[in-house]
């Protein structure tokens, strides 16, 4: 008996061919011998089956001895053996209909689990193999689970159901809701304007939720909420903002925050959380601010950085176009009795300059000038 696999919601055409290339009498029945459809001369007739409004034929091919059964909007319960009776012969076709659905929503937060559930007809023993957009293969039976979804899991998952050495393929689009970057770091000279950006790694028609930026300043004993905001259909509105610092926030996505001035007391790290409507859990992005200050007090030229720097970062003081006078893996360096000229304070990582501040040292009879 011929086996045909179908997909829930799809259409299937079961073929039935007579040896005579002309329109003759035919009937399609199910395993309970209930008539689905057939012909009476050149007329299509339908029986009392549950397929009544979803089953049809291809009238135009009857004259050529072809009498297909076309079933629209397949259901799991359409799985059955279908019998075509034509010319005193019986052609049997076993139809097995499968469905594959994601557990809840196909929009999941980073770190959440994805469960795919296979709907299959009684008596079938299918195997399922799914391939993620990043090429990871998972196998299973009636359910497949992937824990700790990552950003790279966003995209089309292709799942193949195997039964009776035949296969049917499902494609499921999964969107992992996350920020593009888990963490970012901004390096600024004291007094400069600071821009924080929090681009999302997904696009959806309507985006609604609320968010907050908590900030842990390096100099402070506890963290505090700098700003809270609402997101409605991709429009951002500020709910509450601290007086110091007075952050400004962009009205459109991507989420964008502006700190008017980088000051040592603001250096530290923040955590922006975004709670999306109808989702359990929150999106997170860490943001760090490193602030540099170069000063000259009497005979001491000092360069300092505040904020979360890695121990491998190098802080240097050098006179322009000369070798570094001092270079240390520390957060403050200084030079006593500096020569007159333009001094540079550099924060670098493996030779790459991350932050630079210049200070002009005047001959000893004058006061220093910061350009």
């Amino acid at each position: 008996k011929k086996v045909v696999l179908g997909k829930k919601g799809d259409t299937v055409e079961l073929t039935c061919t007579a040896s005579q290339k002309k329109s003759i009498q035919f009937h399609w029945k199910n395993s309970n011998q209930i008539k689905i459809l057939g012909n009476q001369g050149s007329f299509l007739t339908k029986g009392p089956s549950k397929l009544n409004d979803r089953a049809d034929s291809r009238r135009s091919l009857w004259d050529q001895g072809n009498f297909p059964l076309i079933i629209k909007n397949l259901k799991i319960e359409d799985s059955d053996t279908y019998i075509c009776e034509v010319e005193d012969q019986k052609e049997e076709v076993q139809l097995l209909v499968f469905g594959l659905t994601a557990n809840s929503d196909t929009h999941l937060l980073q770190g959440q689990s994805l469960t795919l559930t296979l709907e299959s007809p009684p008596g079938s023993s299918p195997s399922v193999q799914c391939r993620s957009p990043r090429g990871k293969n998972i196998q299973g039976g009636k359910t497949l689970s992937v824990s700790q979804l990552e950003l790279q899991d966003s995209g089309t998952w292709t799942c193949t159901v195997l039964q009776n050495q035949k296969k049917v393929e499902f494609k499921i689009d999964i969107v992992v809701l996350a920020f593009q970057k888990a963490s970012s770091i901004v390096y600024k000279k004291e007094g400069e304007q600071v821009e924080f950006s929090f681009p999302l790694a997904f696009t959806v028609e309507k985006l609604t939720g609320s968010g907050e930026l908590w900030w842990q300043a390096e100099r402070a004993s506890s963290s505090k909420s700098w700003i809270t905001f609402d997101l409605k259909n991709k429009e951002v509105s500020v709910k509450r903002v601290t007086q110091d610092p007075k952050l400004q926030m962009g009205k459109k996505l991507p989420l964008h925050l502006t700190l008017p001035q980088a000051l040592p007391q603001y250096a530290g790290s923040g955590n922006l959380t975004l709670a999306l409507e109808a989702k359990t859990g929150k999106l997170h992005q860490e943001v760090n601010l490193v602030v540099m200050r170069a000063t000259q007090l009497q005979k001491n030229l000092t360069c300092e950085v505040w904020g979360p720097t890695s121990p491998k970062l190098m802080l240097s003081l050098k006179l322009e176009n000369k070798e570094a006078k001092v270079s240390k893996r520390e957060k403050a360096v200084w030079v006593l009795n500096p020569e007159a000229g333009m001094w540079q304070c550099l924060l670098s990582d493996s030779g790459q300059v991350l932050l630079e501040s210049n200070i002009k040292v005047l001959p000893t009879w004058s006061t220093p000038v910061q350009p």
Partner: antibody
Amino acid sequence: QVQLVQSGAEVKKPGASVKVSCKASGGTFSNYAISWVRQAPGQGLEWMGIIDPSGGSTSYAQKFQGRVTMTRDTSTSTVYMELSSLRSEDTAVYYCARDLGDYGLDSWGQGTLVTVSS
Amino acid sequence: DIQMTQSPSSLSASVGDRVTITCRASQTIRSYLNWYQQKPGKAPKLLIYKASSLESGVPSRFSGSGSGTDFTLTISSLQPEDFATYYCQQTYTIPITFGPGTKVDIK
């Protein structure tokens, strides 16, 4: 929903043959028939023929009998339509479409322009 | 072969108008008739199958009626996106045949 993606435009000389492909995705390829329909510039639609789900049976319009061959490759979910002995009046956009019989042609390819010119 | 004719071959209408296109078969095709919409440079789109059944996703302002040899496609309130060419098609017998089309443009 089923997507049908056709091969690119072709320019052929009179007397030559052209083979247009139609790759299906999103549905179960071996479960539905494919019809081919063409449309000459500024003209209406003209049905060329049909290939059944198993690929075992084809039916062609009398006008194209002997010149057209429709085949399907289940391993790549692709249907092919080859038209031979081309003449200038075969210049047209050729469409493949999922044929659900009396339910109509519900999904169409984007079309392939075949230009026959000496 | 069954010949399909359509009338009018073209018509001008305004947004909000009720538009009726007729299709006639040279012999009875019972209810084996489909309607398609085609926009310039695009593939046709199925609107109505078996004379009066609305294809999934097609706006309810489209409706079809008729059986035997005479059929009608009605757009109850023409929308800007409805300006296109409309074709009828019979699936009663091989060869499948289409009507010559009715072009609906802006008045």
